[in-house]
Structures are given as structure tokens and as C-alpha cells.
Interface confidence: low
Amino acid sequence: GHWGAWMPSSISAFEGTCVSIPCRFDFPDELRPAVVHGVWYFNSPYPKNYPPVVFKSRTQVVHESFQGRSRLLGDLGLRNCTLLLSTLSPELGGKYYFRGDLGGYNQYTFSEHSVLDIINTPNIVVPPEVVAGTEVEVSCMVPDNCPELRPELSWLGHEGLGEPTVLGRLREDEGTWVQVSLLHFVPTREANGHRLGCQAAFPNTTLQFEGYASLDVKYPPVIVEMNSSVEAIEGSHVSLLCGADSNPPPLLTWMRDGMVLREAVAESLYLDLEEVTPAEDGIYACLAENAYGQDNRTVELSVMYAPWKPTVNGTVVAVEGETVSILCSTQSNPDPILTIFKEKQILATVIYESQLQLELPAVTPEDDGEYWCVAENQYGQRATAFNLSVEFAPIILLESHCAAARDTVQCLCVVKSNPEPSVAFELPSRNVTVNETEREFVYSERSGLLLTSILTLRGQAQAPPRVICTSRNLYGTQSLELPFQGAHRLMWAKIGP
């Protein structure tokens, strides 16, 4: 043999119980000691440091801390140095060294030593990662190194987490013993933070010890808080909330059309939209994500606003008889009431639509004029004016005539036309045609679609002359012999000498 000792490098026991530190030693055979003695020291292997003596086989003298609390269970003659320590208190925790004493110079303090840990809580071993929905094994492990007191294990707060499996007393690698109880269960997200306890009780004593572990159950996010659809008036402030339950906390992301608007690692996240515009109307998505999964939900934001100024597309110049189609369109939320007026008369209207089509089949000159398209909802009203110009051949109105007074004849020719026509007065008896350009004889004035031309003739005539008014534009020509009326029918202003 050779000098050497074998004992567990570490051993633990509950406060108030006892501990048996298993120990064997060896020495060279040729020494053949008559008696083998031994000493157990506390915390230092060197006698010159005067460490506390735990046990000494030569005498009963021990340090006061170990008085009546230490006993050798092993037979030193059989090279067994097993030590029993009773009524353990925290100050007995530390290093224990054995010194073999074979007499004479043959004394040897072994460098191998045991570290005693005095504990007061069972050790609950939870896997480093506990994931909801995946079976997990939680163990409760307590030292069982006191031959006088054997622990009994029970679980606390395990209701609904399955039935324990007691493995019983197991020998560890270095010869120490443990009692082990296992709990197999499939955790749910609700089990997160659950306080699971293990109790070690020593029968026929008041000694009982409890240890607890809080389950840190990892689970994917579930969005639990989210606005339902939101209606907001243009210009107002909108706050969208997304709240998720997960462990660890999720990365919350607010998105719209695939674009990230805001994100943070948090249980809830607001998306604040200041002074919303119609452009912000749409679907907003909240994505909650952690290492264990993701969830997403959407909310629809509807921005309410007054109609935009209507736009008018279509014919604004038409030829008499043509069909005119005019489209008035706008944008609003909700959709507006659209109306097309002409001189306070409603020509067409639609309710809750964004466009209105006005159809005028075979337009007449009476359709010419100013029109209004009005869009209205509960948030406001906007209107757009447009003009329809109807083009047609000249019409000489029946009010056209001639009248004589003393030495003057005046002929009035009133023409309705679009575009403006040319007017000429023909005197067949004199083989003369007077155009409107001849300002000395013709005065013309236009008002709207009416052109009034007045021909003034001076000098005495035996009989009133025949006067024919001819009006012409690109759509046609009309002529009318102007009837003479009695002098009393007209007020004449004498022009010239």
C-alpha cells in the first residue's frame, strides 16, 4: 500500500440531523503498526496551526464545538476512518481532514478532505428550459447521509402537475447518498411563475425542511389586448394598443403594408398616430414574437373626413343634338351624397357613392349654362361649378322687325346662336347688303347667346323698304324678312342730322 485516503470531496446534510462521512485510508504495509490511531481536524490539515480537533482516538479531548457530537464509526485497524457528526449546526460546515497516526514518525495528514455543507432546504432541480407543452422532469434531491435519521420526501403545490415518482435512496459517485423524488408533467402557460415546493421530513422528529422553485415556463405570445376596428375623424389623435402574453416578453411590432411602424420588447405597445389623415386609413397589424413562437392580429382604422372638392370630367362644349355625359367624382369617408344642380334644379343625385354621372341626351340650347356638383357628408360639404356650352345654328327670333318714324327706318334683328354668328341686312329693292361691320349703319350688342343687331336707315321713302336679316355661323344660316310694325310700336331715337 501507500499513503492515501478516500472520502467524498463534498457531502451535505440537513441542519439538526447528522452526517456520516465515509472514509478509507491506506499506508505502506512494511510499517506494520501495532495500533493505528487517527485524528480528524476541522478546516486545516496542519497540526501546527492548532486546528479544532473533531475526533482523536488517543484521547477523548475534542474542541468544544464537537463535544458530544463526533464519533468514529469506522475501525481504524481496518483502515476505515468513517466519521459521524450529530446535531449539526451551521458552524460545523467546512473542511474535514483526517490524519493517520501509526506511532513514532509515521504520522500522515492526508491532503484529501471532505467539505461538509450544512443545508436547510431541499434541492429542487428544474431543467434550464421549461417550455409549455413539452414534458418536463423536475426532481427533488436531498442528502441521505445520516444513518440515524432518514428523510421522507413530499411535493408541495404540485396539484394538477402529475403524480410524483419516488426513486428512493441513490448512491452518488463518491459514496454519498441522496433521496430523489421526480415529478413529470407537461407545463402550460398558466404554470409560469407557479411555486413548486419539496418537503423533507424526518419521522419521529420536529425536523422538516422546505425548498421552493418558481417555474419559469417559456411560451409563445398570444395577443390578448387589441382595439377592435377604430373610427377616427381626420385630424384627431389615434392610439392603437397591442398587448401580448408570453414568456419571455415578446418583440411587439406594429406594421402596415409590410412596413414596420414601431417595435419594442414589451408586454404592450401603443401606436400613436397624431392628426390622422385619410392616407392612414387601412389595416394595421400587430406581430408578437419570441423564441417560442408568434401571434398576429389586425385592426382596421377608418379615418372619417369631409368630401374633397369634386372633380368634373366630360364634355363641356357640345353641339345641339349630341349626347352629353359628365362625371362628377370626389373622395370622402363615409361616401357622400352627390348632387348636380342647374339653376337650383336638381338634375341628378346619388347617395353614399363617390361618383355621379349626368347624361343629357340630345342637348338643346336650353341646356347651355352653369352647373354645380355638390358633395356632402356629416363632416362637411364641397362644391364645384362647371359650364356646359351648347353650340347650334343661328335662330332669328320672332321679335325681330323693322319700324319707320319720320325720316328714319330702324330694323331690329335678334339672333340666338352659339358660337356668335355674323349678321347682314339685305335690301333687295336697292340691291344693297349691309354687314354688321359697317358701324355707321349697324349697331350690334351680344348678351349671352343673344346677338341684337340694329340697322338704321335715314331719308324719306315712299314705301317702307323690304329688309332681310341673314345670320350665319359654322352650323348654318337663317334668313328672315323683317316685318314692319306701326310707328307707335317703337320709340325711335333720331340718329344723325
Epitope: P128, P248, P249, V265, A266
Partner: antibody, heavy 126, light 112 residues
Framework: EIQLVQSGPELKKPGETNKISCKAS????????MNWVKQAPGKGLKWMGW????????TYADDFTGRFAFSLETSASTAYLQISNLKNEDTATYFC???????????????????WGQGTLVTVSS | NIMMTQSPSSLAVSAGEKVTMSCKSS????????????LAWYQQKPGQSPKLLIY???TRESGVPDRFTGSGSGTDFTLTIINVHTEDLAVYYC????????FGTGTKLEIK
């Protein structure tokens, strides 16, 4: 340049309330937590707790619950320590010190205090 | 809380000498998942605020001279200053930031 500038020294009577400010500059205020550390005259350092500048959530050490309150004015990049019902044993220099926040909750990653304020001496005496 | 004990409480050396100071924690500050020691060293000169020297037990903060070296793991740590300068006069604190943050009792370095 990263700086934490604290308010000036204070002389207070027992029972009064004191509020110390710590203005940060040279970095993004909300990317770093703000710690408060107490140093009694001639003594060592004692951690009082910290405030998460991103969420506003304070965490107090066991000995500093009740009379002590951490707060923020994020827009001004300023953290505050308020001590109410002052006692003689509150006489000390109080330091603010920043440390990185890890929003993703990875355990203990990098909670070392790298920049400190110059300290504010609070003297409590009747 | 994890208790941090520093030794010696004070020491005096001449400029140019090497100095070591110790810091022991009541529990290990080695975090198993990343194998990092959550221990820092600070220097506090008279009338000044603490200055970070070392973090992760051995990583030197930028701008700190390479005369300062941190070592150790678990519960036992050492700060070594080689070629001590007169401006190194200060109190040196170790600090664990694994659990509720605690500081060591401090080691006062005086220059002879």
C-alpha cells in the same frame, strides 16, 4: 462626450425631502439604465437600485425601499432620486451611474456601471 | 446578498512597484450559462466618483492603462497593478453584478 451631471450639494433638516437630479448627455438616454449608489462619509459604496429609462420601472435594493423614489424626465434626459423624511444616516454622497439595458431579458448580460456622475453631497443636520 | 470581502484593507507601496489586492465573494459569481464572472473593479480617487477599470473579472475598460490586470474566477479575484504610478493613489473596490449588486469593502492604496 458622455457625461452625467448631478445637482449641487444640499443641506437639509431631518424630516425634510430632497430631490437630486442627474442629467445625461452624449448618448441615447433610454438605451441605458440609471443606477443610484450611496457613499456615506469615509465609507464604501452601497447600491440603492436602478431605474429602467426605457420603461420607467424602478428597482430598489432591500435597504432602500419606502422613503426612496427614482423618477425620470425622459425629454430632458434626466433621472431623479428623491429621499423623503430625511434622517441623519442619509448624510452621504449620492452617485448616479449608467448601465446597459438589455430589452430582450437575456440573464444579467452586461449590467456593469461604466459612467458615473460627479456625486451630490446631502447633509442632514438639525 | 453576495458578500464581497477585500484584503488588505490598505497597503502602501513605492512608485514603480507591483501591487496585488484580493476580493473574495461569499458565493460564486461565475454564471454557468455564459461562463462569465460578473465581477468588476473600480478606482475611486479622493474626492472623485468611481471609475470603471475592469469588468467580466479580466476585461480592461477602454482607456485604462495595461498596468491594471484583473484575474480570478468563481469566488476569488485579484487586481494587480504593475509599475505603480503616484496617480494610482485611490481606493479600489470590487463589485459583483450577478445578484443584487454589492461592492467590496475597498482596498486603500497609498504611495510611500
Amino acid at each position: 462626450e458622455i457625461q452625467l451631471v448631478q445637482s449641487g450639494p444640499e443641506l437639509k433638516k431631518p424630516g425634510e425631502t430632497n430631490k437630486i437630479s442627474c442629467k445625461a448627455s452624449g448618448y441615447t438616454f433610454t438605451n441605458y439604465g440609471m443606477n443610484w449608489v450611496k457613499q456615506a462619509p469615509g465609507k464604501g459604496l452601497k447600491w440603492m437600485g436602478w431605474i429602467n429609462t426605457y420603461t420607467g420601472e424602478p428597482t430598489y435594493a432591500d435597504d432602500f425601499t419606502g422613503r426612496f423614489a427614482f423618477s425620470l424626465e425622459t425629454s430632458a434626459s434626466t433621472a431623479y432620486l428623491q429621499i423623503s423624511n430625511l434622517k441623519n444616516e442619509d448624510t452621504a454622497t449620492y452617485f448616479c451611474a449608467r448601465n446597459p439595458i438589455n430589452y430582450y431579458g437575456i440573464n444579467y448580460e452586461g449590467y456593469v456601471m461604466d459612467y458615473w456622475g460627479q456625486g451630490t453631497l446631502v447633509t442632514v443636520s438639525s | 446578498n453576495i458578500m464581497m470581502t477585500q484584503s488588505p484593507s490598505s497597503l502602501a507601496v513605492s512608485a514603480g512597484e507591483k501591487v496585488t489586492m484580493s476580493c473574495k465573494s461569499s458565493h460564486s459569481v461565475l454564471y454557468s450559462s455564459n461562463q462569465k464572472n460578473y465581477l468588476a473593479w473600480y478606482q475611486q480617487k479622493p474626492g472623485q466618483s468611481p471609475k470603471l477599470l475592469i469588468y467580466w473579472a479580466s476585461t480592461r475598460e477602454s482607456g485604462v492603462p495595461d498596468r491594471f490586470t484583473g484575474s480570478g474566477s468563481g469566488t476569488d479575484f485579484t487586481l494587480t497593478i504593475i509599475n505603480v504610478h503616484t496617480e494610482d493613489l485611490a481606493v479600489y473596490y470590487c463589485h459583483q453584478y450577478l445578484s443584487s449588486l454589492t461592492f467590496g469593502t475597498g482596498t486603500k492604496l497609498e504611495i510611500k
